[in-house]
């Protein structure tokens, strides 16, 4: 794993150089996670979002944290159990399971520094991996070998 | 807009306490990422990570940069342009179709900070959005309204 | 019972900043954020952003984000919002409002209010 | 942004009426929706969180319901000090976003 010079800001430092300079990059609410506005049921629309058209339709969690970045995540979670028919978009089918899709993201908490012989020194940004999941998707049952 | 409380080191200043602390926790590649040990071809198969049993198959393309956070991405690339029999796991349905799941990613990039007077001061982190593909998931095709 | 206490009027010329304090009392300060929000006259209420009292993070509305900065003392227990580069448009009553860290981001304690006047 | 769109904008009742004021957003916000009350000159007050939860002190007369997009906040009898503004707040997505109000006055 690649580290990269950083440091602990203590109070008084001068923090106008910013470590973490931020773009000028719109940051819009991610694809996926803009609300659908068809009614959440298991059923795969003919029109709207991505997750309102699958045959393995989702919807959207909010995760919030305000200590946490970032502090908004969004959790997928399965609308039917089965796949649905693409010939009726609405009959599920039992031979293939909506089954959800797990990413490891990584997030920043913000945790107090210690230096040396454990005097506080400032904030540090801990980073953590912490589970998302991001679609559903149609698949084959797996046959036990 | 999300900001962090950060400053950008100069040279000579102690980094022993990490703004960036990396936790101990393994970070293995996302489970999805983890490279299918099946024939990557337009299949569905009984066994196997998600990706493989899919019926919109995927495999996934590494994206490496050494000067970005994090170094490594994935990005899924469509087996198939339409979905995968549920009764067969190979031959292709045309009443649906396979399409790329997209997230707009927050990546850092290492830039040389600015001082005073334009000097070199160390190294900052530039925060931007990466389009990434997460997965393929089997829609039913729009119908233009 | 949980109070937010806002600083004072304020009369501005156009290009120059306001800081508006909150301070806030009866609660576990870093337990909480504090949200901003403003209230042109006669108009409706517009989110300017927010702050963790612990972390420090912020998220900041688009239409502001260049010319605001959100900062909390936790010795203090006092919030602040700055906006430079003031407008006449920036005129209106600024509110700071306690927020949960968590899902559920409903504003359940607001302060006064400070009327900002932006005006030659 | 979603947008909040809240009807009527305004209405006039009498005491002891049952009044229902109804906020529709743009898109699924789920039930990520407070309602607040507001009074000339005076910061919002907080009436009901996540669609229907009603906030520590505030009348059982008061009651908030739907998901998705429709939601309604309800005074089952509507009482002399019910006057003011009542606004939604939508907060599932930054940034949050509020309706235009309601005003309730008192015939």
């Known amino acids: 794993y690649s580290h990269w010079p950083s440091c602990c800001p203590s109070k008084g430092q001068d923090t106008s150089e910013e470590l973490l300079r931020w773009s000028t990059v719109p940051v819009p609410p991610l694809e996926p996670a803009r609300p659908n506005r068809h009614p959440e049921s298991c059923r795969a629309s003919e029109d709207g979002p991505l997750n309102s058209r699958a045959i393995s339709p989702w919807r959207y969690e909010l995760d919030r944290d305000l200590n946490r970045l970032p502090q908004d995540l969004y959790h997928a979670r399965c609308l039917c159990p089965h796949c649905v028919s693409l010939q009726t978009g609405s009959h599920m089918d039992p031979r293939g399971n909506s089954e959800l899709l797990y990413h490891n993201q990584t997030v920043f908490y913000r945790r107090p520094c210690h230096g040396e012989k454990g005097t506080h020194k400032g904030y540090c940004l801990e980073r953590r991996l912490y589970r998302v999941s991001l679609a559903c998707v149609c698949v084959r049952p797996r046959v036990m070998g | 807009y999300s900001h962090w409380p950060s400053c950008c080191p100069s040279k000579g200043q102690d980094t022993s306490e990490e703004l960036l602390r990396w936790s101990t926790v393994p970070v293995p590649p996302l489970e999805p990422a983890r490279p299918n040990r099946h024939p990557e071809s337009c299949r569905a198969s009984e066994d196997g990570p998600l990706n493989s049993r899919a019926i919109s198959p995927w495999r996934y393309e590494l994206d490496r940069d050494l000067n970005r956070l994090p170094q490594d991405l994935y990005h899924a690339r469509c087996l198939c342009p339409h979905c995968v029999s549920l009764q067969t796991g190979s031959h292709m349905d045309p009443r649906g179709n396979s399409e790329l799941l997209y997230h707009n990613q927050t990546v850092f990039y290492r830039r040389p900070c600015h001082g005073e007077k334009g000097t070199h001061k160390g190294y900052c982190l530039e925060r931007r959005l990466y389009r990434v593909s997460l997965a393929c998931v089997c829609v039913r095709p729009r119908v233009m309204g | 019972q949980v109070q937010l206490v806002q600083s004072g009027a304020e009369v501005k010329k156009p290009g120059a900043s306001v800081k508006v304090s909150c301070k806030a009392s009866?609660?576990?300060?870093?337990?909480?954020?504090i949200s901003w929000v403003r209230q042109a006259p006669g108009q409706g209420l517009e989110w300017l952003g927010w702050?963790?009292?612990?972390?420090?993070?912020?998220k900041y509305a688009q239409k502001v984000q260049d010319r605001i900065t959100m900062t909390t003392d936790a010795s203090t227990t006092t919030a602040y919002m700055e906006l430079r580069n003031l407008r006449s448009d920036d005129t209106a009553v600024y509110y700071c409002?306690?927020?949960?860290?968590?899902?559920?981001?409903?504003?359940?304690?607001w302060g006064q209010g400070t009327l900002v006047t932006v005006s030659s | 942004d979603i947008q909040m769109t809240q009807s009527p904008s305004s209405l006039s009742a009498s005491v002891g009426d049952r009044v229902t004021i109804t906020c529709r957003a743009s898109?699924?916000?789920?039930?990520?929706l407070n309602w607040y009350q507001q009074k000339p000159g005076k910061a919002p007050k907080l009436l009901i969180y996540?669609?229907?939860s009603l906030q520590s002190g505030v009348p059982l007369r008061f009651s908030g319901s739907g998901s998705g997009t429709d939601f309604t906040l309800t005074i089952s009898s509507l009482q002399p000090e019910d006057f003011g503004i009542y606004i939604c707040?939508?907060?599932?997505?930054?940034?949050?976003?509020f309706g235009g109000g309601t005003k309730v006055e008192i015939k």
């Open positions: 409002a306690r927020v949960g860290t968590g899902t559920d981001s409903y504003f359940d304690f």
């Open positions: 009866e609660y576990t300060f870093s337990n909480y954020g």
């Open positions: 702050i963790g009292a612990y972390s420090g993070f912020t």
């Open positions: 898109q699924n916000i789920n039930s990520h």
């Open positions: 996540t669609a229907s």
């Open positions: 707040q939508q907060t599932y997505i930054t940034p949050l976003t």
